[in-house]
Amino acid sequence: DYKDDDESRTETQPPVTNLSVSVENLCTVIWTWNPPEGASSNCSLWYFSHFGDKQDKKIAPETRRSIEVPLNERICLQVGSQCSTNESEKPSILVEKCISPPEGDPESAVTELQCIWHNLSYMKCSWLPGRNTSPDTNYTLYYWHRSLEKIHQCENIFREGQYFGCSFDLTKVKDSSFEQHSVQIMVKDNAGKIKPSFNIVPLTSRVKPDPPHIKNLSFHNDDLYVQWENPQNFISRCLFYEVEVNNSQTETHNVFYVQEAKCENPEFERNVENTSCFMVPGVLPDTLNTVRIRVKTNKLCYEDDKLWSNWSQEMSIGKKRNST
């Protein structure tokens, strides 16, 4: 298809040829093209391209362009050739190639497809059935990410209330750019009756740590010492903790934000791998104090998506006073 636009026409530069589009993995869309026929010999060819909504303009010498995009709607790329990297230079006539999502009734596609990466060890995706689907639909979830050679099928399909879901192992690879990439997801049915739904989950978002595990509570003077086990797989600069202390007598609950802290006081079991400690000041030892802890990722490591871990199991210390 030619976009015959007077503003983008130049006399010297012919359009690119053989523009084609293909899909790799689940959501990697790749456009390739050949140089224009009869391009000026003194022209160092560069290619101008942008998507249909004039977004993501790019000028580059390569004869290909790719994008990772959930194929839930039609996407088009327009490409032209020019003799410099100057954005103000008018490229040749722009050639356009589009790719449409798989066929199917849009009302049959699953909705609210979302995934959470639990403790950097497994990903759990969930979705709601589309409006035009039969209640006995058997769903299949496929996933792909950079460290997989091929697309995998998720085996652990489950149902929780109205939601369907599936979970699969996804372990953080140490010392790599693993987390700078994404997981590509597709959900369809075994019978091929529903329109497939796609999602792309960046590995820097939707991360939910496991809850901490409280190991020990002890008093020293009027201070309460709390020791807990950190969730595995995270580095210390990427987590912080919320320690909640409820006092039965005063009916107050105090909340403290805590950095992962070394267990240096003699009151703590020292040098225990992967544990943190915190001293809560001014706690009444002769009353019942109940402690619970949850953990959240730091926005400098993972995108802010408001995902706290579940609360730890509560642990109590002190005596509940008899009401007189």
Epitope: R237, L239, Y257, Q259, A261, K262, K296, L300, D304
Partner: antibody, heavy 118, light 104 residues
Framework: EVQLVQSGAEVKKPGESLKISCKGS????????IGWVRQMPGKGLEWMGV????????RYSPSFQGQVTISADKSISTAYLQWSSLKASDTAMYYC???????????WGQGTLVTVSS | EIVLTQSPGTLSLSPGERATLSCRAS???????LAWYQQKPGQAPRLLIY???SRATGIPDRFSGSGSGTDFTLTISRLEPEDFAVYYC?????FGQGTKVEIK
């Protein structure tokens, strides 16, 4: 007591290089991020970037990426902010601050005034 | 990129009055990450509130923070003479432009 002590005021010419410092004490220097904040004369606060001295991991605000370099020497509990070629527009007060994982700046240095003028 | 907009730009009040400062985020943010600072002329800023509502160590209880999502508030219940200053809200790499609380 947590303290961050910054190096003294500097007067420089455009094109010169500069490295200012921020020494932490009274806490585990390697366990907290250090952030740098710029305040131009009569203006508000601007977040420049952070470093985690434990592993020297840095993050820059897009406006300051490539303009400054943040580094740290954990053996002497000191963080640095440096310029390879100063401009008149770099004239400002620069603060370092301790930056816990929840993102507030809970302890601040006294500030280093940098004046760049020909 | 999240933008924090503070209002009003300047608040003219008398000692003993209540001050209400607003900070609005351009998109919903986690309240865990919202902080408030006070800055007096010639001094470094001082942390008042973190996690939207938790008072920092040594901050008097006349200062309180509230809010969630996109709307956050710093309240000074009764202004003391030493409270006249500039107040900033912050979320990680973004600061609001500041609200000046001045004596009427």
């Amino acid at each position: 007591e947590v303290q961050l002590v910054q190096s003294g005021a500097e007067v420089k010419k455009p094109g010169e290089s500069l490295k200012i410092s921020c020494k932490g004490s009274g806490y585990s220097f390697t366990s907290y991020w250090i952030g740098w904040v710029r305040q131009m004369p009569g203006k508000g606060l601007e977040w420049m970037g952070v470093i985690y001295p434990g592993d020297s991991y840095t993050r820059y605000s897009p406006s300051f990426q490539g303009q400054v370099t943040i580094s740290a020497d954990k053996s002497i509990s000191t963080a640095y902010l440096q310029w390879s070629s100063l401009k008149a527009s770099d004239t400002a007060m620069y603060y370092c601050a301790r930056f816990p994982n929840w993102g507030s700046l809970d302890h601040w240095g006294q500030g280093t005034l940098v004046t760049v003028s020909s | 990129e999240i933008v924090l907009t503070q209002s009003p730009g300047t608040l003219s009040l008398s000692p003993g009055e209540r001050a209400t400062l607003s900070c609005r985020a351009s998109q919903s943010i986690s309240s865990s990450y919202l902080a408030w600072y006070q800055q007096k002329p010639g001094q470094a800023p001082r942390l008042l509130i973190y996690g939207a509502s938790s008072r920092a160590t040594g901050i008097p209880d006349r200062f309180s923070g509230s809010g969630s999502g996109t709307d956050f508030t710093l309240t000074i219940s009764r202004l003391e003479p030493e409270d006249f200053a500039v107040y900033y809200c912050q979320q990680y790499e973004t600061f609001g432009q500041g609200t000046k609380v001045e004596i009427k």
